[in-house]
Interface confidence: medium
Amino acid sequence: DQVDVKDCANHEIKKVLVPGCHGSEPCIIHRGKPFQLEAVFEANQNTKTAKIEIKASIDGLEVDVPGIDPNACHYMKCPLVKGQQYDIKYTWNVPKIAPKSENVVVTVKVMGDDGVLACAIATHAKIRD
């Protein structure tokens, strides 16, 4: 279930897990179904807030992902203390009307009070029924 991602911050992310996805194999996002994501990262700052930002590039067109709860503190115990590891489990209900694509790049960023807490890019996602 551990997937390969590109770090887009300072290697705060220790691992990313997606049920049914492995390594650098294609990771299928099914339309109209929940998509589960778990990430373990080390806090690079003391922060009492943590905000999730998810963007997707679908066939080269960048879009904001709808239906995202931006408050990361709903999914892990805040406040975060610098140097401690945190486990965030997040479920996104994929819209039924999401476009099908074989070329999806997803960027997940977690922002703290003092900037980026963690950032990961998944380059091998696909949206299918």
Partner: antibody, heavy 121, light 113 residues
Framework: QVQLQQSGPELVKPGASVKISCKAP????????MNWVKQRPGKGLEWVGR????????NYNGKFMGKATLTADKSSNTAYIQLSSLTSEDSAVYFC??????????????WGTGTTVTVSS | DIVMTQSPSSLALSVGQKVTMNCRSS????????????LAWFQQKPGQSPRLLIY???TRESGVPDRFIGSGSGTDFTLTISSVQAEDLADYFC?????????FGAGTTLELK
């Protein structure tokens, strides 16, 4: 189990003010909310408000606005509640309690020892 | 404000019996994004500070015996003690951690026969 250490009982006259302290162990003090809870016999528990010692941010229960003032001293890991214009209705046990900072992690996982305030002439 | 209503106000049981107490909120405590219910249960023994037993309606705090079981969703919640022990003599309070002002139920007193 870890407990927050509170100051001793207070006997105060009506109209006076009182300040209670709550000392937390360790360095996580600045990164938790410190809450105050009032308990009167037969009246259950009432949330007074909370302070985030890291930056002094406060939230109050509207019922206690003007009655309670919350402060904190990061250097000594101590939170304070000051109660003013005291009446018999303010006679109660006051607890401090720690909660997480996340928007909805507002349950109290560590409690203080409690301070009894008695308002009497 | 969210009003929390507990029932019954008191219970008298014998050691080994199963006990169930209820807590109802005036509005739903379910977060639809993560399907968590923002309800906590506390135990307070005479002359002591409250102690956290359960949060997110059913997650047991570390060190809490597994005879304490939290359940329920939305507006209706239950704390069950599967086999009451003498040391469980206490008041039990529910608290919503969904919105400020944070509010508590009036409590259920557990007495032993």
């Amino acid at each position: 189990q870890v407990q927050l250490q509170q100051s001793g009982p207070e006997l105060v006259k009506p109209g006076a003010s009182v300040k209670i302290s709550c000392k937390a162990p360790g360095n996580a003090f600045s990164y938790s909310w410190m809450n105050w809870v009032k308990q009167r016999p037969g009246k259950g528990l009432e949330w007074v408000g909370r302070i985030y010692p890291g930056d002094g941010d406060t939230n109050y229960n509207g019922k206690f606005m003007g009655k309670a003032t919350l402060t904190a001293d990061k250097s000594s890991n101590t939170a304070y509640i000051q109660l003013s214009s005291l009446t018999s209705e303010d006679s109660a046990v006051y607890f401090c309690a720690r909660s997480g900072g996340g928007t909805l992690y507002w349950y109290f996982d560590v409690w203080g020892t409690g301070t009894t305030v008695t308002v009497s002439s | 404000d969210i009003v929390m209503t507990q029932s019954p106000s008191s219970l008298a049981l014998s050691v080994g019996q199963k006990v169930t107490m209820n807590c109802r909120s005036s509005q739903s405590l379910l977060n639809s994004f993560n399907q968590k219910n923002y309800l906590a249960w506390f135990q307070q023994k005479p002359g002591q500070s409250p102690r956290l037993l359960i949060y997110f309606a059913s997650t047991r705090e570390s060190g809490v015996p597994d005879r304490f079981i939290g359940s329920g969703s939305g507006t209706d919640f239950t704390l069950t003690i599967s086999s009451v022990q003498a040391e469980d003599l206490a008041d039990y309070f529910c608290q919503q951690h969904y919105n400020t002002p944070l509010t508590f139920g009036a409590g259920t007193t557990l007495e032993l026969k």
